[in-house]
Structures are given as C-alpha cells and as structure tokens.
C-alpha cells in the first residue's frame, strides 16, 4: 500500500504548455489561408491548497481552495490562462477575398488558478 | 444497461452555482471581524463542443475546445469565473486595531469557458 | 538556397493519370506551402494547387476534381497526379513555393524548371 | 474568380527605352495583393515585384511596381539586354490564385 501510494504520480501545478495547432487538423484549413496553424499553448495542471503566489490567483481562487480543503464537494479552481496575445490571420470572406484580420485571444502568454 | 445509461446524470453546462463561505468554516474568523461570512458563488460545468455564445468564451478557448473534439489529450476549456466583484470587510490588523479593506475578485458575477 | 527539382514521365496517354514529383533541397519541406502552376506550350500560366507538410491542400476549382497534391516529409519532396487526363493537359509542369506567413503569403518563389509532360497515344 | 488582363500582348522597344506594362483585374485585388514575374525562354519565371510594389530579392532597382485595386503596372526604366522576355502578373488576394495572360516584351 505504501509503495503503491509512492507511485501514484505527483500531478505537476498550473502551468503552461505547448501545443501547436494544425489548422487542417481542426478544419479550418478551408477559410484559413495563412498561417496554415500556430503555437496556441494551453494551461494545465492542479491548483493545490495553499494557492502559491506564482499560481497567479484572485481571492475568490483562494476563498474556492481553502474551501474545497474542507469540504470537497466544492470543486477546486481551474488551471486557465489569464493572459492571452492576438495573431494576425489572412482568411477567406465569403466573396473567396484574402482579408487580413487581428485575431484577439489566441495564444496563451500565461496560467493561473481561477 | 438501457436504464443505467438513462440514469446516468447529463452534465450541465457550465454557470455559476450558489456557495455561503462561513468564515469559521475555513479558520478565518480568527482575523476577520465582519461580515461572518458571505455568498462566493461559484462556476462549475461543462463546456461542450461546440462552445455556445453564452458560455462567455475566449478565441483561444474555442480553438482549444476543437483541438479537445479531434484530441482528448488536450483537456477541454473549464468553467471558471469570468467576472468577479468586491466586498468590504474589518479585519483585525497585527495591532488588533480593526480596520475596513474593500477586498477585489471575492464574488462571482459570471461565468465562461476559458 | 533553396532548390526545386521536378521529375516524372514526360509522356502520358489519354485517360491515363499524370505523376510528378518535386524534390526540395537547401530547405526543409515543413516551413512552406508548396504549389503546382502548369503551362500549356506557348500559353499562360495556370495554378493548379497547393499543398502544407501537415496535407492541408488547396486546388483551383477547374481541377479539383481530378487533382491529388501529397507530401512525403521524409524524402523532402511533395508529388502531383492529375486523372483523366487529355490532350489539354500538355504543359510544363513547375513546382514552386508560397511563403506560408500572412507577411509573405501568395506568391511563388523560387520555381523549379519545369518539365514538360505530353499527352498523346 | 479574378482575371487579369495584361496590355500590350507584345511591346516592341529598344535598349535603353523605358517599358510601361499594364495589369488589369475584372474586380479590386485586395491589400494589393500582386506579382509580376518574368520569364524567358526555355525558363521557368522569376519573381521581380510582390505586394503590387515591394522588390524581391536580387531584383534591379530598374523594375518597379505600382497600382491597387484593380489596376497595376510593371515598369522598366532602362531596358537591359537581358530584360526582353514575357512579364505575368498574378493576384493571390482572392481564391483561386490567377495570372494574366503575359506581356512580350521584344527588342525594336
């Protein structure tokens, strides 16, 4: 039993990781001309009781865990981005036109736990 | 096995549910003098593919959430809160003075898939 | 610098399927979009499609239906083959790159020299 | 589609003159989105223009471009030797991509 809890892998804190996405992949290759994908990172990870600084929180985060450590029907706050960037993109309008748009929100430039 | 998948409970989408914080509850009557408590709220849910407009959505969520339908490697977009507001409260201070603090992001006015 | 190379056989009989294929050097096959533009004997150009490393493709409407564009990461190369085809299809084949950024995205540089494919029985 | 139409089919100049050539497209070409290539024969074509304006690499500063919406022109101030050959334009502001029909450019 205590070698099997050993094991039981230590699940990492909210934090941001790669992820490329293939605009093919997805099927929006179609009215996507260029960038045919980007690196649009995603956040993961556990948002453990106490809520370290680096996690990036906001009071009710912190209220939410303390929470959930004393009654686990509450759920835990959520590993998300809380900072995002834009990218530009050429698209295909509904006249077959090449437009140039800023897409806001697209990439995660950091995670925390809301 | 036709009426366990029956009963089995449908997720609802994600919204914000009520929660009553008692400050004694989480060990903070200790410091805080008023209120004893107050009304957090908090967001639980699903966020589904394809993200519907109520469900306060970023770009980046959305792309997330269709990497998520073709690759459930990558975890879908979570329900957390979207729009938070503050409450006043007196504390004690390390002199046992008691002082009022407007406390930022305590309690949860929406939602959204992030 | 980057280098295209086409190659393939230079005569195809009617209804048969043309198959060419472009070899790039200098430049790995992951960064760009990769097109086809063909050119009938003493006639304009025509683009016939593209492709990314991924397989995202796009084709000219008029050909669609008969074009196949694919990618082989692996040998740096990608590869053309149109059905059906007529006496119509008697071109020089070029292979060529499009920048796939929104900065630079449309136009064909470099090309590669071409290569004459003749349908006839 | 986006057709581009191309004047003079030939133009005959001599060395050392100046070279006009024209691009016309049945609708606005957005962003400016226009090529010009040269290409001569036995050759595959070279880029000279992108973005309507903006040089490529290499390219002598004797070719310029200019135009937008739906009329663009390639010109040469001081024809070379070497600059006599067929001229296409091409539009990638709108799917599918299109060229014009060429312009031959032919010593006098």
């Known amino acids: 039993q205590a070698k099997h809890k050993q094991r039981k892998r230590l699940k990492s804190s909210c934090k941001r990781h790669p992820l490329y996405v293939d605009f093919s992949d997805v099927g929006w290759n179609d009215w996507i001309v260029a960038p045919p994908g980007y690196h649009a990172f995603y956040c993961h990870g556990e948002c453990p009781f106490p809520l370290a600084d680096h996690l990036n929180s906001t009071n009710h985060a912190i209220v939410q865990t303390l929470v959930n450590s004393v009654n686990s029907k509450i759920p835990k706050a959520c590993c998300v981005p809380t900072e995002l960037s834009a990218i530009s993109m050429l698209y295909l309008d509904e006249n077959e036109k090449v437009v140039l748009k800023n897409y806001q929100d697209m990439v995660v430039e950091g995670c925390g736990c809301r | 096995q036709a009426k366990h998948k029956q009963r089995k409970r449908l997720k609802s989408s994600c919204k914000r549910h009520p929660l009553y914080v008692d400050f004694s509850d989480v060990g903070w009557n200790d410091w805080i003098v008023a209120p004893p408590g107050y009304h957090a709220f908090y967001c639980h849910g699903e966020c589904p593919f394809p993200l519907a407009d109520h469900l306060n959505s970023t770009n980046h969520a959305i792309v997330q959430t269709l990497v998520n339908s073709v690759n459930s490697k990558i975890p879908k977009a979570c329900c957390v809160p979207t729009e938070l507001s503050a409450i006043s409260m007196l504390y004690l201070d390390e002199n046992e003075k008691v002082v009022l603090k407007n406390y930022q992001d305590m309690v949860v006015e929406g939602c959204g898939c992030r | 610098q980057v280098q295209l190379q086409e190659s393939g056989p230079g005569l195809v009989k009617p209804s048969e399927t043309l198959s060419l294929t472009c070899t790039v050097s200098?430049?790995?096959?992951?960064?760009?979009?990769w097109s086809w533009i063909r050119q009938p004997p003493g006639k304009g150009l025509e683009w016939i499609g593209y492709?990314?490393?991924?397989?995202?493709?796009r084709y000219n409407p008029p050909l669609k239906s008969r074009v196949t564009i694919s990618v082989d990461t692996s040998k740096n190369q990608f590869s053309l083959k149109l059905s059906s085809v007529t006496a119509a299809d008697t071109a020089v084949y070029y292979c060529?790159?499009?920048?796939?950024?929104?900065?630079?995205?449309?136009?064909?540089?470099?090309w590669g020299q071409g290569t004459l494919v003749t349908v006839s029985s | 589609e986006i057709v581009l139409t191309q004047s003079p089919g030939t133009l005959s100049l001599s060395p050392g003159e100046r070279a006009t050539l024209s691009c016309r497209a049945s609708?606005?070409?957005?962003?400016?989105?226009l090529a010009w290539y040269q290409q001569k024969p036995g050759q595959a074509p070279r880029l000279l223009i992108y973005g309507a304006s903006s040089r490529a690499t290499g390219i002598p500063d004797r070719f310029s471009g200019s135009g937008s919406g739906t009329d663009f022109t390639l010109t040469i101030s001081r024809l070379e030797p070497e600059d006599f050959a067929v001229y296409y334009c091409q539009q990638y502001g709108s799917s599918p991509l299109t060229f014009g029909g060429g312009t031959k450019v032919e010593i006098k």
């Open positions: 060529a790159r499009i920048c796939s950024s929104t900065s630079c995205w449309g136009w064909f540089d470099p």
């Open positions: 492709i990314y490393y991924s397989g995202s493709t």
């Open positions: 609708q606005s070409v957005s962003s400016s989105y």
């Open positions: 200098g430049d790995s096959i992951s960064s760009y979009y």
